[in-house]
Structures are given as structure tokens and as C-alpha cells.
Interface confidence: medium
């Protein structure tokens, strides 16, 4: 899923889910002056970034598991 780096929303596409084993960390960006949407940006173990759909139940479980592991940025 593509990520842009302007002062606006970063995610142009989102994935409904991704294998937890591929994720190194997750950054949950709350809505604010940069973007009026919650954005979930996963950094993968291969160094790439992927945007995940914050409304997806699978993504919510992933966030919960990673937060519990304490490996968020």
C-alpha cells in the first residue's frame, strides 16, 4: 500500500490485514492537523511500509497484539 510524505494523509491505499510475523512495528496516527483520519502505518521486517485499514477487525487485533508486545514507535 503506497505511502506519501506530505503534510496530509499519508495512506492512499490500505490493506485489510497482514501477517503479524511480517510486521516490525506499527505507528497509529491519530486524526489531527495533518489528516482528518486515523491512519495505521506498519513498518515491515523487509523495511517497507504498509498502510492498514483502521476499521478492519483484523487490523484492530494486530494493533492490540503489537501494543501488548510493546513494540510500537
Amino acid at each position: 500500500a503506497s505511502v506519501v510524505t506530505e503534510l496530509r494523509c499519508q495512506c492512499l491505499q490500505t490493506l485489510q490485514g497482514i501477517h503479524l510475523k511480517n510486521i516490525q512495528s506499527v505507528n497509529v496516527r491519530s486524526p489531527g492537523p495533518h489528516c482528518a483520519q486515523t491512519e495505521v502505518i506498519a513498518t515491515l521486517k523487509n523495511g517497507k511500509k504498509a498502510c492498514l485499514n483502521p476499521a478492519s477487525p483484523m487490523v484492530q487485533k494486530i494493533i492490540e497484539k503489537i501494543l501488548n508486545k510493546g513494540s510500537t514507535n
Epitope: 494523509c9 495512506c11 490500505t14 486524526p31 489531527g32 492537523p33 482528518a36 483520519q37 485499514n53 483502521p54
Partner: antibody, heavy 116, light 107 residues
Amino acid sequence: QVQLKESGPVLVAPSQSLSITCSVSGFSSTTYGVHWVRQPPGQGLEWLGVIWAGGSTNYNSALMSRLSISKDNSKSQVFLKMNSLQTDDTAMYYCATQYHYPFAYWGQGTLVTVSA
Amino acid sequence: NIVMTQSPKSMSMSVGERVTLSCKASENVGIYVSWYQQKPEQSPKLMIYGASNRNTGVPDRFTGSGSATDFTLTISSVQAEDLADYYCGQSYSYPLTFGAGTKLELK
């Protein structure tokens, strides 16, 4: 249950200013943002601006010079102030909450009429 | 500013028919499009967010789809209570903008 209620209705003379209060309950304005949107009679929706949990704001650039949004977290109230009103500012003014996405819940709106 | 263009401006349908409303963005807005229903003398109500996510309590006959610049709201079998104006809106960049709306009327 999230509820929003705008003060009003309001009659404003041309060139005068407008103040509306949005009272929120069921969620915290210290956690989520609150947007203001207006709708002229028989027309579509126009976004005015938003105040975020931390107090920062974004405005519609077309109206920014006339607009101010502020809040009082202790009273769970959000304020819209607009000056130099003209007849084409006559509209229904709504406040709406931010959640993960904007405009999740809306107030019932308040009619602002600009007339001499 | 991103311009959201809705079509048609109005449509007249019979109960049970399938309805497709279109919304086009003037530039790529990803999936940051929502759909709102506004009944006469009422506030707008969020129906679909993130292009395809149905809001809580919205009947499953309402489906949102699309990404980038082309978005669709489909009502699989229109009911009398669906008579309303429907607006799309983008939240990808400021200022947030809405389409001019589609009025859904019943025959």
C-alpha cells in the same frame, strides 16, 4: 451515547458577528476533534473548520480570515465565531464529532439568518 | 481544493430497484471518502466511511466501493425510507470538501 447540540437559532444583521456554542456529551473533546459544517437553504454542505483534541485548528481557507473555533474542555463546549456576516452566510450551522473519521455524529443544527 | 462531483443530481426510483450513485474526485483521495444521508429537515447521517466501511446501524443494502478518484454508493433494493439527499465527502486533504449531492426520489 454521543450527543451534540448547537445553541440558537440566531438572527444577525449584515456586517455583524456570529457566535454559536456546541455542547457535547457522551464523548470528550479532549480526546476527539469537533468540526463545523454549514448548509445554505436548499444547498449542499460546506466544511468550515475543526478543533482538535489538543486545541489546534484547521480552517477552510476561503473563510479563515473571518472564522475562529475554540473550546472549553471543562464545560464540554466548542465555540464558533464568525465576523463580517453577509446574507450569503445564511445557513444551517452544524457541529459534528471526529472519531477515527470525520462527521461521525452530527448536532441537530442551528439556523443562522443574516438579515437587516 | 479537491472537487467532488456527484451524479446524477437527482433520480426517481421504485421500491425494490437497485440504485447506483456516483462520486468523482478531482484528484487521488485514496479511500478517504465518506457517504452521508440527509432526510428532509434532518441532520446528515454518516452511512459509509473509508470508501467501503458501513457505519454502525446502517442496513446492509447500502454498499460503498471505489478508490483513488471514482466512488460508488449502491443501494441493492431501495426502500421508501431511503428517500433522501446523499452526499459524498473527502477527508484526504484540507479543506475537507463535499459533493453537491444526489436527491433520491421515489416514483
